[in-house]
Every structure is written in C-alpha cells, then in structure tokens.
Amino acid sequence: KESCDVQLYIKRQSYHSIFAGDPFKLECPVKYCAHRPQVTWCKLNGTTCVKLEGRHTSWKQEKNLSFFILHFEPVLPSDNGSYRCSANFLSAIIESHSTTLYVTDVKSASERPSKDEMASRPWLLYS
C-alpha cells in the first residue's frame, strides 16, 4: 500500500552559506496526498522554535512535491541561524529537520569567499 503520510524533505544537517544583501529562497519540500496541509516556518532560539509571522512565503509545485518557500529579500545578518518547517495535518504536527543559514556580512569581507572557503573559515560566519 502506498504511503499517504505527509512528508517534509529538508535534509538532515543541511546548511546554506549565503551573503547578507542577497535575495534567498529557503525551500521546504512537502509531500501530501489529498489536501495540502498548513505549513509554517520557525527559527530556532535555543530549544524553542519561534514561529515566523508576517514573512513573505509562497508555494511552488513540481511533480508530486509542493515547496513552501520562505523569502529573504534581502538576507540580513540577523537571519543567521537554524530554521524548521512544520505541517499541521489531521490535528498532528509534523516537523522537518532543521536547516542552518550561515550568513556572511559582505561589508566585513573585501571580496566574497567561495563556499569551500566559507566551510573552512568559520570566523567569517556569525555565531
């Protein structure tokens, strides 16, 4: 029997190294069968995930997945941190893995480092 559970496909331990001042779209891939669940984004503050209110979000569809997108227009240094999406389905809450945004403030770097440089130079990242 084919599974009809809601699934959220944010990859475990995923991260995105991005630059302040750029636009960025954070994708939450959602699989559902009949009715699209209500999906929200939150940002982790310690062990609590604080729901993001009043942010620009949108949906896109490809094949059998829908993508609930959180828009950063533009990315701010304060956007650094870990995010999670969650779906409200049949009165149950399904939570995704968290995904981390590492924001580099381009004002503090004379030129943009590469992704590989950023991975090996954590002092460039906001903690």
């Epitope: 699934q7 496909y9 990859k11 475990r12 331990q13 995105h16 190294s17 960025f24 994708e27 699989k31």
Partner: antibody, heavy 116, light 106 residues
Framework: QVQLQESGPGLVKPSETLSLTCTVS????????WSWIRQPPGKGLEWIGY???????NYNPSLKSRVTISADTSKNQFSLKLSSVTAADTAVYYC??????????WGQGTTVTVSS | AIQLTQSPSSLSASVGDRVTITCRAS??????LAWYQQKPGKAPKLLIY???SLESGVPSRFSGSGSGTDFTLTISSLQPEDFATYYC????????FGGGTKVEIK
Amino acid sequence: QVQLQESGPGLVKPSETLSLTCTVSGGSISSYYWSWIRQPPGKGLEWIGYISYSGSTNYNPSLKSRVTISADTSKNQFSLKLSSVTAADTAVYYCARDFYYGMDVWGQGTTVTVSS
Amino acid sequence: AIQLTQSPSSLSASVGDRVTITCRASQGISSALAWYQQKPGKAPKLLIYDASSLESGVPSRFSGSGSGTDFTLTISSLQPEDFATYYCHQFDYYPTFGGGTKVEIK
C-alpha cells in the same frame, strides 16, 4: 522536462585531476540538489556528493579529501573535480537531480578511464 | 555512513513470476529509501521512493514496503523488460546504495 548531460575527458592520467561538467536543461539548478554518482566497471553505484540550490555541498566521507563540486548558475551547470586519481577511479560517472526523496533524473553517464 | 545490504545478489526467474528483493539498513532510516532499476549501459531509473510510493510512470506491478531497517521491492508479475539490476538507496545525510540484485532469465 529536465534533462542532464555529462561532459568531460574520457581519459585521465594517474595523479591528475578528473573534471566533469553536467549541463541541466529544462529546469534550473537554483532549486533542488544536484548529485554526482559513479559506477566502476561491473560494480555497483557509489554516491560522490551533491551541491544544493544555494551552493552548499556534502561529500562522501571516503572521497571528501579529493572532491570538489561547484555550480555555475549563469550556465545552469554543475561540475565535479576529483584530484589525485588512480585506476580505482575508473568508472561511469553520472550526474543526477536529487529530488529530495531520490534521484529522479539522471544523465546518460560518461566513461572515465584512468590510465597513463 | 549507513550501510545497505541487498539480498539476493542475483536471482533467476521466469516471465510471470513474483519476485521479491530485500534491503536491510545498518540502522533505522524510517521510510527514507528508494529503489532503482538499471539496465546494461543505461542510467538507473527511479521506481519507488519513501519505501512504498510509486514514481510517476512506473508500472503498478512494482511495489515497495518496509520501514526502519527492513525493506522489500516486489514485482508482482515479472515482464520481459524487467530483467535488470535493482538497487536500493537511502537518502540520509550521506546517501548510500545497496550492492544490487541482478534479475536474470531462468
């Protein structure tokens, strides 16, 4: 629909760097994840690594010290570099779209032989 | 990294047979497992995702089941075009593939 095409030299000398490019048509690499997989002659599939829509990467731990995957969004391409190759790196190399739950679109594969 | 062990490594079957291939993960992966079919000289083709969901365009004679560590791919009635090698694949942080099962004509 999305299509992928690998390109690059079919013959690489030992100790040199293998470089391959995957050109994506019918879709944008600014969404999803994009993987490289290889298959040595007569053997099974081995995941090499992926690059995300933001450019972040994740590599197979057994190959991590030798692998770099990068993307050029202006050309809608992503690339693989594998350094210090040996005969054990002889394989068919595939690029694929990682559609979160599995690799749903693959290139046709390109054979790379490591030999002097 | 999570290891996937497929069995059998090869099998012989006839057209119309019911074929079952198993895949065991070295640790629990929930339903994060896919199955592929590969024919000689061709790229793999996604058949099943989320352990039991049929990829679009794949015939309904293919089905998947399982969760946690033990998974099964079943072909309910083997067709001539189904003779191929089948791989399981877990898509955790470090994706891995099973060793493959070659389905041959008896």
